[in-house]
Interface confidence: low
C-alpha cells in the first residue's frame, strides 16, 4: 500500500515579510518524525501522531518547502511553492525638460524598485488620467519609456507613472502606486525678432516711448523682456493680450550716451531668446539762447544782441549767420524810440544723422524815452458846435507809458481824453495837455472853439 | 529647509530712498521667482512686481512703477527693493515670496521688513 | 486689474464649528491654458502670510485636510471642517492669472 504526506496549505501566496503556518500531516500508521526541509525561518508549533505543525516567519522571496517522513523503512515526501507579493518600494517619473518646444517630442522615464511577482506587475505613464504607455515590469530597478509629442494643451498638464501588481487571480485585488506627479511647461516661440517701435533720434535728457511686441507667443504670461538703451536697462512694463506680448518702457537719454546707440529688445521664454537690434542717435541740442546786453535800455544807449547755442549748432540773428557753427551771432544798435518794443529772432539749426532739426528763439527789447504827444493825432485848433457830441483824440507814448491830461487854462476843468463827451459852450478856451512819466512832461496846446448852437 | 531672511526695519525721511534685501537660502536662488508684497493698514495686501533671478528681468504692478525698483545679486541668494521718494503713504510693511513655475503660488514668504517714513 | 472681493469681513465661530469663506473675482480667473490661479492665505497675528491651497483646491505641503478649496471662473470658496486654535487669523485669497496679482480684502476669524 502507498501512503502520502501532504503540505497544507498548497502553493500559498502571501506579502513580503509574512508569516506562514503549514501542516504536514500523513495516513502511515507507523511513521516516524516529521521533519520540514525550508530555507526559511521555521518553528515546531505543534505534533501528534502522523502530524506536524510548523511556523514560517519573515518569508521575504519565493520558496519550495518539503515535508518527509519515514514510513515502514521509506521515506515519502510532500512539497509546497510559497509565492510571495510586495508593493514596490519607488516609483519614480524622471524630471521633464523645464521647458518643452510645442510640436516636439519628449521622452517620459519612469523608474520602478522593487515590486514582487514582476510577472504581475506592469507599469502605466500617464497624462492627467490619460494613458500614454502601459508596460511590464522587467528588469531591477524596471525602467519604462514613451515619447510624447508636446501640445499647447499639455502645458500646466501632470504627468505621472504608476504601477499595478494584479493578484487578482489569486484573489488578493489589484495594487496601484503612483509617483508624484510632474507638471509639464511647454512654449511656443516664433522665429522671427520682435517688432522694435523706437525713435531714429533722442535728444539728452529727453524722454520717449519705445515699444517692443512680439506675436505668436506662447505662454505669453511666462516670457521675461529685457528693453535697453546702450547698456542702460529700461524700466519696461510688459502686457499679455492672449498670444501677443508688448512690453513699454521709457527711453531717457543721459548726457554721456551722446552719438550712436542701439536700442535693444530681447524676449525669452523656455531658455530660448528673440532679440531685435534699432540704431539711435543721441543728440545734444542746447539753445538758442538769445541775450541783450540791457533788456531795458535808455534812448540812445548801445545795445548787443547775442544769440548763441550749442557746439554744431549753425545759429542766425535777424538773418544774420554766425561765422561758423558752434560760434555766436551778434549784432549792435543805438537805442531809440522806435526800437521800443521790436523783437529780436534767432534760428538755430542742427545736423543729426543727415536731418536738420530747427529750433528758434526770441527776446524783446524795451527802451526808455520821455513822453511825447503826437501832433498828428491832436489836433491844436478845434471847432465844435455846441451840444454835440465829440471825442478829444489826442494820443501820447513813451516808455514808461505816460498818462495824459487836459486841463482847461485858468480852472482845473478837465476834458476825457479818447472818450466821446457832450461839448457845450462853457468847454470854450485853451487847454494844456499833458503827457507826464517818470521820464518827465510834455505840453501841447489845444484850443477850443465852441460855435453856440443858434435856433431860428 | 527653504528659508527668506529679509533686512531689518528701517525708520526714513520723506523724500528719501530705501534698499531693503531678501536673502534666500535652502533652495537654488535662479529656479524660482521672487515676488514683493506690500501691507498697509488702510490697503491690505498689495503685489508690487516679480523678478526672475536667472535672467534679472522684472514685471511690476504699474502702481509701483518709478516707485519700486527689484534687482537681484545672483553670487550672495539675495534680493533687494529700493523704494525712492518716500512719503508717508509708503508706510507699511514690505514682504519678498518666492513661487515655483508651479504651482505658481507664493510659497514661502520672508518675515517682512518695516519702513516707516517720518520727519 | 482684477479686483477680488472676500465676504465676509469677519466670521466669529466656535471651535469645532465649520467654516466658509468666499471669494469673487471681477473677471474670470481661467488662464489661457486651462489652469485657474487661485490661491488662498492665511496670516497668524504677527506673522508672515503662508500658503494654504493653490490653484482652487490643492493644498499645500503640511496644510491639514480640514482644509478645503473649491470654486471655478469667478467664484470660490475655502471651507475649514472643524475649526481649531491653530486657525485663528486673517484669510486673503489672491490671484495670479493675471497682471498685476491681487489679494482680496481679507477675513478675520475669530473666536465667538
Known amino acids: 500500500q502507498e501512503f502520502l504526506l501532504r503540505v497544507e496549505p498548497q502553493n500559498p501566496v502571501l506579502s513580503a515579510g509574512g508569516s506562514l503556518f503549514v501542516n504536514c500531516s500523513t495516513d502511515c500508521p507507523s511513521s516516524e518524525k516529521i521533519a520540514l526541509e525550508t530555507s526559511l525561518s521555521k518553528e515546531l508549533v505543534a505534533s501528534g501522531m502522523g502530524w506536524a505543525a510548523f511556523n514560517l516567519s519573515n518569508v521575504t522571496g519565493n520558496s519550495r518547502i518539503l515535508c518527509s517522513v519515514y514510513c515502514n523503512g521509506s521515506q515519502i515526501t510532500g512539497s509546497s511553492n510559497i509565492t510571495v507579493y510586495g508593493l514596490p518600494e519607488r516609483v519614480e517619473l524622471a524630471p521633464l525638460p523645464p521647458w518643452q518646444p510645442v510640436g516636439q517630442n519628449f521622452t517620459l522615464r519612469c523608474q520602478v524598485e522593487g515590486g514582487s511577482p514582476r510577472t504581475s506587475l506592469t507599469v502605466v505613464l500617464l497624462r492627467w488620467e490619460e494613458e500614454l504607455s502601459r508596460q511590464p515590469a522587467v528588469e531591477e530597478p524596471a525602467e519604462v519609456t514613451a515619447t510624447v509629442l508636446a501640445s499647447r494643451d499639455d502645458h500646466g498638464a501632470p504627468f505621472s507613472c504608476r504601477t499595478e501588481l494584479d493578484m487578482q487571480p489569486q484573489g488578493l485585488g489589484l495594487f496601484v502606486n503612483t509617483s508624484a506627479p510632474r507638471q509639464l511647461r511647454t512654449f511656443v516661440l516664433p522665429v522671427t525678432p520682435p517688432r522694435l517701435v523706437a525713435p531714429r533720434f533722442l535728444e539728452v535728457e529727453t524722454s520717449w516711448p519705445v515699444d517692443c511686441t512680439l506675436d505668436g507667443l506662447f505662454p505669453a504670461s511666462e516670457a521675461q523682456v529685457y528693453l535697453a538703451l546702450g547698456d542702460q536697462m529700461l524700466n519696461a512694463t510688459v502686457m499679455n493680450h492672449g498670444d501677443t506680448l508688448t512690453a513699454t518702457a521709457t527711453a531717457t537719454a543721459r548726457a554721456d550716451q551722446e552719438g550712436a546707440r542701439e536700442i535693444v529688445c530681447n524676449v525669452t521664454l523656455g531658455g530660448e531668446r528673440r532679440e531685435a537690434r534699432e540704431n539711435l542717435t543721441v543728440f545734444s541740442f542746447l539753445g538758442p539762447i538769445v541775450n541783450l546786453s540791457e533788456p531795458t535800455a535808455h534812448e540812445g544807449s548801445t545795445v548787443t544782441v547775442s544769440c548763441m547755442a550749442g557746439a554744431r549748432v549753425q545759429v542766425t540773428l535777424d538773418g544774420v549767420p554766425a561765422a561758423a557753427p558752434g560760434q555766436t551771432a551778434q549784432l549792435q544798435l543805438n537805442a531809440t524810440e522806435s526800437d521800443d518794443g521790436r523783437s529780436f529772432f534767432c534760428s538755430a539749426t542742427l545736423e543729426v544723422d543727415g536731418e536738420f532739426l530747427h529750433r528758434n528763439s526770441s527776446v524783446q527789447l524795451r527802451v526808455l524815452y520821455g513822453p511825447k504827444i503826437d501832433r498828428a493825432t491832436c489836433p491844436q485848433h478845434l471847432k465844435w458846435k455846441d451840444k454835440t457830441r465829440h471825442v478829444l483824440q489826442c494820443q501820447a507814448r513813451g516808455n514808461p507809458y505816460p498818462e495824459l491830461r487836459c486841463l482847461k487854462e485858468g480852472s482845473s476843468r478837465e476834458v476825457p481824453v479818447g472818450i466821446p463827451f457832450f461839448v457845450n459852450v462853457t468847454h470854450n478856451g485853451t487847454y494844456q495837455c499833458q503827457a507826464s512819466s517818470s521820464r518827465g512832461k510834455y505840453t501841447l496846446v489845444v484850443v477850443m472853439d465852441i460855435e453856440a448852437f443858434s435856433s431860428h | 529647509e527653504v528659508q527668506l531672511q529679509q533686512s531689518g526695519p528701517e525708520l526714513v525721511k520723506p523724500g528719501a530712498s530705501v534698499k531693503i534685501s531678501c536673502k534666500a537660502s535652502g533652495y537654488t536662488f535662479t529656479d524660482c521667482i521672487i515676488l514683493w508684497v506690500k501691507q498697509s493698514h488702510g490697503k491690505g495686501l498689495e503685489w508690487i512686481g516679480k523678478i526672475n533671478p536667472y535672467f534679472g528681468t522684472t514685471t511690476y504692478n504699474l502702481k509701483f512703477k518709478g516707485k519700486a525698483t527689484l534687482t537681484v545679486d545672483k553670487s550672495s541668494s539675495t534680493a533687494h527693493m529700493q523704494l525712492n521718494s518716500l512719503t508717508s503713504e509708503d508706510s507699511a510693511v514690505y514682504y519678498c515670496?518666492?513661487?515655483?513655475?508651479?504651482?505658481?503660488?507664493?510659497?514661502?514668504w520672508g518675515q517682512g521688513t518695516s519702513v516707516t517714513v517720518s520727519s | 486689474d482684477a479686483v477680488m472681493t472676500q465676504t465676509p469681513l469677519s466670521l466669529p465661530v466656535s471651535l469645532g464649528d465649520q467654516a466658509s469663506i468666499s471669494c469673487r473675482s471681477s473677471?474670470?480667473?481661467?488662464?489661457?491654458?486651462?489652469?485657474?490661479?487661485l490661491h488662498w492665505y492665511l496670516q497668524k497675528p504677527g506673522q508672515s502670510p503662508q500658503l494654504l491651497i493653490y490653484?482652487?483646491?490643492n493644498r499645500f505641503s503640511g496644510v491639514p485636510d480640514r482644509f478645503s478649496g473649491s470654486g471655478s471662473g469667478t467664484d470660490f470658496t475655502l471651507k475649514l471642517s472643524r475649526v481649531e486654535a491653530e486657525d485663528l487669523g486673517v484669510y486673503f485669497c489672491?490671484?495670479?492669472?493675471?497682471?498685476?496679482?491681487?489679494f482680496g480684502g481679507g477675513t478675520k476669524l475669530e473666536i465667538k
Open positions: 489672491s490671484q495670479s492669472t493675471h497682471v498685476p496679482y491681487t
Open positions: 515670496a518666492r513661487k515655483e513655475a508651479y504651482p505658481d503660488a507664493m510659497d514661502y
Open positions: 490653484k482652487v483646491s
Open positions: 473677471q474670470s480667473l481661467v488662464h489661457s491654458n486651462g489652469d485657474t490661479y
